[in-house]
């Protein structure tokens, strides 16, 4: 009675039980009941990252400098190039097939989480006692100028694009 | 590369042994099921015998059932057929040749068994 | 048994004409497992088909097969002097035996 269905890392052709082609290699020829599998390995600019029964490799992914992009993990025979982009760009999508600048954060606002190769900057609002006076990718916000530390009194109140201005305290006359 | 070479062949009298061999090289021999077909002299092509990569499975054409006994030995990469109670229709070139899912896609080059008395 | 009829048995052609040879089975032959061989005078076979019709590694595209079921052809389109030689077809679906048919001459006119 032919099989149906197979074990795991098999497949079904013809009636008849196959071993896959492990990680790195590809199908040269179904299996016959007297003659195992025949796997042969993936070139050196390719791949195949699962048991798989496939007769042509996977091209590596290019890493194109053109947009952008620089190689972070040289791919293998089992596993596909991984790029990532170069200083001050991220990446547009998780497959990484471009890059953008890094956003800036606007006077008011800080950096929150500084961009990646992969991730944006994250930027937040300067809150209550902090201010931003710059367009900055790597600038957090700035707590005010603390005028007491200094024997000085606050003349201009400070906003979340400007820092507090300070002057000499007012003597008071006998 | 990838070749079969036979060897054993023979004049022999009927009723009588020969063993042939055929050595595999350039290919992972003990992943592949052996054939041997014959040839008798001005005829066309006779499936005498398989084997398995593994030795296990074994199968053969009527003619020589019982008497012949095909064999592999993968760690000399050598496939051998026991030719025993030889008889005039014998007589042939015998081939060995690799199993594939494509067919026989490898032969050697073939050696001449003749049984005559 | 599986038994394979090959017709004609001496086809006499010239060179740069076409050659059609049949291959006939007195059963289907499952999963189209019919291949084809080319034998010349002193020679070993050299598999030319496999699976009735993909051509084997460094066969020339002038080789195509076709067919299925119990009709098989191998068709040269353009005959090169090296052609001439006798070719059998064989059916590796249904064991034991596998069994070949009596071959095809394709001689020079």
């Known amino acids: 009675e032919p099989p149906t269905a197979c074990r795991e890392k098999q497949y079904l052709i013809n009636s008849q039980c196959c071993s896959l082609c492990q990680p790195g290699q590809k199908l040269v020829s179904d299996c016959t009941e007297f003659t195992e599998t025949e796997c042969l390995p993936c070139s050196e600019s390719e791949f195949l990252d699962t048991w798989n029964r496939e007769t042509r490799c996977h091209q590596h992914k290019y890493c194109d400098p053109n947009l952008g992009l620089q190689v972070q993990q040289k791919g293998t025979s089992e596993t596909d190039t991984i790029c990532t982009c170069e200083e001050g760009l991220h990446c547009t999508s998780e497959s990484c097939e471009s890059c953008v600048p890094h956003r800036s954060c606007l006077p008011g606002f800080g950096v929150k989480q500084i961009a990646t190769g992969v991730s944006d900057t994250i930027c937040e609002p300067c809150p209550v006692g902090f201010f931003s006076n710059v367009s900055s990718a790597f600038e957090k916000c700035r707590p005010w100028t603390s005028c007491e530390t200094k024997d000085l009194v606050v003349q201009q109140a400070g906003t979340n694009k400007t820092d507090v201005v300070c002057g000499p305290q007012d003597r008071q006359r006998a | 590369q990838v070749q079969l070479v036979e060897s054993g062949g023979g004049v022999v009298q009927p009723g009588r042994s020969l063993r042939l061999s055929c050595a595999a090289s350039g290919f992972t021999f003990g992943s592949y099921g052996m054939h041997w077909v014959r040839q008798a002299p001005g005829k066309g092509l006779e499936w005498v015998a398989v084997i398995s990569y593994e030795g296990v499975k074994k199968y053969y054409a009527d003619s020589v059932k019982g008497r012949f006994t095909i064999s592999r030995d993968n760690s000399k990469n050598t496939l051998y057929l026991q030719m025993n109670s030889l008889r005039a229709e014998d007589t042939a070139v015998y081939y060995c040749?690799?199993?594939?899912?494509?067919?026989?896609?490898?032969w050697g080059q073939g050696t001449m068994v003749t049984v005559s008395s | 048994e599986i038994v394979l009829t090959q017709s004609p048995g001496t086809l006499s052609l010239s060179p740069g004409e076409r050659a059609t040879l049949s291959c006939r089975a007195s059963q289907s032959v499952s999963y189209d497992y019919l291949a084809w061989y080319q034998q010349k005078p002193g020679q070993a076979p050299r598999l030319l088909i496999y699976?009735?019709?993909a051509r084997a590694n460094g066969i020339p595209d002038r080789f195509s097969g076709s067919g299925s079921g119990t009709d098989f052809t191998l068709t040269i389109s353009r005959l090169e002097p090296e052609d001439f030689a006798v070719y059998y077809c064989q059916q590796y679906a249904d064991y034991p035996p596998f069994t070949f048919g009596g071959g095809t001459k394709v001689e020079i006119k």
């Open positions: 040749a690799r199993d594939t899912s494509r067919g026989h896609d490898i």
């Open positions: 699976g009735a019709s």
